[in-house]
């Protein structure tokens, strides 16, 4: 069973009084409706809360919004609805919050049917003041900020126009018509697809991919016969229709579309899809859907060019049309990802990789748990994690797995222990070493969040009944204390804490219901007095990530280096604080064949770490193309895994081969790459 609240746990002294003095209630004078919450900036304490209520009238629905602002992490809220002239805000657009600490907010208003364009409310002072601006178009999407300059906005209109503003939405200019999809790239570049013959849907597979680097003054067509495109890390991907049939395949560019290479990935048919699961500046995880309505596909991992791909995981669960996948980046430990596979018997199993997709294994059975009814052998089974797919299937799973970069090694997730994911009520499990080992943390489903970089974990039981109790742990989930935050239980709707897990405040959202009224209410609890003192050097202990066998000289080596961290001791009850920076010490490892992937034209036979040349590429529907022309590709068969930092050791040297493959995609032909100016 999970560790409880027994005396052995060593309670935090006088915590009830400390928390009671730091519990702040706010009742919202609204009919219930819906509520959305956004944090404005980092470490500013500013929260915006938008409540909306639809009043169904005979002919139409009348909408009413209220906007509230807090500047103390949710302890107090002020009704600022008058700043937006009591206008109804369209919740489907959400609150568009500017990047970094720009303090910018855009709210999109509902306007009456006959109006010429939409209306937005803009703030650039963390929502202290708003300016109303009438738009020359009706927006189809939320305003998108340029990551480099928060004054630059783009939006698509309901007429498929691409509109750009250079002064934070004050003035708008339509820079292109017939646009299907637009995205900001780096350096204020905009990529977008256009249609020629009527509509985005009709032209799917015949779209053009355009780029503007000067906010619409000039354009370059960087691709034709486009089905869709995506950005990931430093890579630009486009799926392109083949000449001969209805299949399409991925092309990749690392220079903003000036030159393209055909990715060494299988082509897909009409009913299939590609999906970028994760990408960084080193590499990309790509899912390629299987033919037919299977609900699974294959994960491939790329080389540093995004061109050569290694098969990483078969039967990867990803429901048709790219609906749900459990693929999760464990952000608390480098190289760790968790996902689900659909096994032959249609059961779903969780897999984990610790080396960025090189090898996948089942999750180790938690020490304090027994195998459930799904297990054939009651002594041998694994932990299976509930993520997006379970949530979509309406299983009793209130939250997806949680990890935070500054709470090193901590992963919290709902799971079941057996041979596969179970439909039984799950429990909550925690790992303190990035997924290598797991412990049952809480019995039954819970909402959970990490505060103070892992110094506190907070949880609330998932229940259909009203609740008034919150649980917290100061030792990474080993022991729990319970605190009754209100006498009158509330119907709980969500936990909110500032993104980044550095805060010590948690807000509990819900509503109260009495005979006649129903009101939104929030309780914000500040844990600062639980963690009374600042952590000192003595409160931290050394930990080697990815350690599995200390007798192995290279213990802890992942992608060519090992990392030691200073981590908060489990028994230390102190504040990491807002400015906490993870202390880590990397050390380079010697290279082994594991640090290399096989280059184009080579493969690894099963259970062998050597790359051998493919006799010929028959049976492989893979064409290689570099920069759109016949190319000499010299290779020794090995290529360092992206992000691998190993030095010395094994250096795979063998005769350098000249590989010549013709490029057959007219997508890349230079005459298609014409420039145009407005």
């Amino acid at each position: 069973s999970a560790p409880g609240e027994d005396e052995e746990c060593g309670r935090v002294r006088d915590f009830v009084a400390k928390l009671a003095n730091n519990t702040h209630q706010h009742v919202f004078d609204d009919l219930r409706g819906s509520v959305s919450l956004s944090w404005v900036g980092d470490s500013t304490g500013v929260i915006l809360v938008l409540t909306t209520f639809h009043v169904p009238l005979v002919i139409m629905t009348f909408g009413q919004s209220k906007l509230y602002r807090s500047e103390d992490y949710g302890k107090n809220f002020k009704d600022i609805t008058d700043l937006i002239n009591n206008t109804f805000i369209r919740t489907e657009f959400g609150m568009a919050i500017g990047p970094e600490n720009s303090g910018k907010v855009v709210l999109t208003a509902e306007v009456s049917g006959g109006s010429r364009g939409g209306r937005i409310f803009r703030s650039s002072d963390f929502a202290k003041n708003f300016v109303q601006t009438d738009l020359p178009f009706h927006p189809l999407t939320q305003m998108m900020y340029s990551p480099q300059n928060s004054d630059y906005l783009l939006a698509l209109s309901t007429e498929n126009g691409l509109w750009v503003s250079k002064n934070f939405g004050g003035k708008w200019e339509e820079i292109h018509k017939a646009v299907c999809l637009a995205k900001w790239g780096s350096d204020n570049t905009i990529f977008f697809t256009t249609y020629a013959n009527g509509s985005c849907k009709a032209d799917l597979g015949a779209l053009e991919l355009w780029r503007t680097s000067d906010l619409g003054k000039s354009f370059k067509t960087i691709g034709v016969k486009i089905y869709s495109f995506g950005l990931g890390g430093r890579f630009l991907f486009a799926s392109v229709m083949a000449d001969k049939d209805t299949t399409r395949r991925i092309h990749v560019s690392t220079d903003q579309g000036d030159t393209w290479s055909m990715a060494q990935l299988p082509s897909v048919g009409q009913e299939q899809f590609y999906s970028i699961l994760a990408a960084n500046d080193d590499m990309v995880f790509m899912h390629v859907d299987e033919p037919g309505d299977t609900g699974f596909g294959t994960i491939f991992t790329s080389d540093d060019r995004g061109i050569v791909y290694s098969k990483s995981l078969d039967r990867h669960l990803y429901t048709t049309t790219g609906g749900e996948t459990d693929f999760t980046n464990v952000t608390s430990l480098r190289g760790v990802y968790i996902t689900s596979v659909l096994s032959e018997d249609n059961s779903i199993q969780t897999m984990i990789t610790f080396d960025q997709g090189g090898r996948w294994t089942h999750l180790r059975k938690p020490e304090n748990s027994e195998c459930d009814a799904t297990a054939k052998n009651k002594n041998e089974c694994s932990l299976h994690i509930h993520a997006s797919y379970s949530i979509s299937q309406k299983l009793n799973v209130p939250m997806a797995p949680l990890s935070e970069p500054n709470a090193v090694g901590i992963v919290i997730a709902h799971g079941s222990v057996g041979d596969a994911i179970s439909v039984m009520v799950p429990d909550v499990y925690i790992s303190d070493d990035g997924g290598y080992s797991w412990t049952k943390m809480l019995e039954g489903p819970h909402y959970y969040t990490i505060l103070d970089s892992g110094g506190i974990i907070v949880a609330i039981e998932h229940s259909s009944r009203p609740i008034n109790v919150i649980k917290f742990s100061t030792d990474e989930g080993q022991c729990w204390q319970t605190y009754t935050f209100t006498r009158d239980p509330i119907y709980f709707t969500g936990l909110a804490s500032e993104p980044g897990a550095r805060s010590m405040n948690i807000s509990i959202w819900g509503f109260t219901e009495s005979f006649l009224t129903s009101q939104w209410v929030s309780y914000t609890i500040d844990f600062k007095d639980i963690l009374e003192r600042n952590c000192e050097e003595k409160d931290y202990t050394a930990w080697l990530a990815h350690s599995t066998d200390p007798e192995d000289y290279e213990d802890g080596c992942i992608l060519g280096y090992k990392e030691q961290f200073l981590r908060l001791r489990k028994s230390s009850v102190c504040q990491n604080g807002r400015d906490y920076v993870v202390t880590k010490q990397p050390s380079i490892c010697l290279c082994s064949l594991e640090d290399f992937l096989c280059d184009f034209g080579y493969y690894r036979p099963e259970n062998d770490s050597k790359c051998v040349e493919q006799p010929e590429l028959k049976g492989h529907d893979l064409e290689f193309c570099l920069y759109g022309r016949e190319e000499h590709l010299t290779t020794n068969g090995y290529r360092k895994i992206p992000g691998d930092k190993c030095q010395g050791g094994v250096n795979p040297v063998r005769e350098v081969k000249d590989l010549k493959k013709k490029c057959t995609s007219n997508f890349l032909s230079p005459e298609k790459q014409n420039s145009k100016s407005n």
């Epitope: 052995e8 746990c9 060593g10 090694g409 070493d433 290598y436 080992s437 030792d475 080993q478 022991c479 003595k538 202990t541 050394a542 930990w543 080697l544 990530a545 990815h546 350690s547 200390p550 007798e551 192995d552 000289y553 213990d555 802890g556 090992k562 030691q564 200073l566 001791r569 489990k570 028994s571 230390s572 010490q585 050390s587």
Partner: antibody, heavy 124, light 106 residues
Framework: QVQLVQSGAEVKKPGSSVKVSCKAS????????ISWVRQAPGQGLEWMGG????????NYAQKFQGRVTITADESTSTAYMELSSLRSEDTAVYYC?????????????????WGQGTTVTVSS | DIQMTQSPSTLSASVGDRVTITCRAS??????LAWYQQKPGKAPKLLIY???SLESGVPSRFSGSGSGTEFTLTISSLQPDDFATYYC????????FGGGTKVEIK
Amino acid sequence: QVQLVQSGAEVKKPGSSVKVSCKASGGTFRNYAISWVRQAPGQGLEWMGGIIPIGGWANYAQKFQGRVTITADESTSTAYMELSSLRSEDTAVYYCARQGRKTGYYYYYGMDVWGQGTTVTVSS
Amino acid sequence: DIQMTQSPSTLSASVGDRVTITCRASQSISSWLAWYQQKPGKAPKLLIYKASSLESGVPSRFSGSGSGTEFTLTISSLQPDDFATYYCQQADGHITFGGGTKVEIK
């Protein structure tokens, strides 16, 4: 089989320093923390501090802070403990011990291999 | 620093007896506790780590239990070789040892 072999007995004058060595053989020295523990005649065990050879991360018990320096030389698989400003109360047997490791934590699993001990006598 | 209080400080027992030594931590240390045996003139020997895990090569008559602040070392049937001094040691926080329990022949 891992062994920790310590340097020989020392007799020191009050106010001077002593440096005790601890050489590991037969195991991966770099992957374990080495702790130093002392035992005064007829007394219990007292932890002085420890070091992780990779990177040389050292930490010390509050009582010895500023007076003890623990170092490690990966190339020779040797750890050192230097205690300065010696006084008669520092007369004790000084042990080095390897911290057992089951996960990435260096200090959580007890000390599974011990040196034979080095007697340090402080006397004027 | 975390204080470890061991009791009793001396224990008289006979061969075959069941012997229990307790150790109390001044604050919760979860399961991060080790037990050692030391004989005169010798270095300590690890018996138990993580409160209840038996170190390899240690006879199964030794067992450990507890978590949080209260811990116990039990010798189910005392053998002639077991007369020695026993120490507990907390491993979470700067390491501290208990004062020791001397098990002597009754």
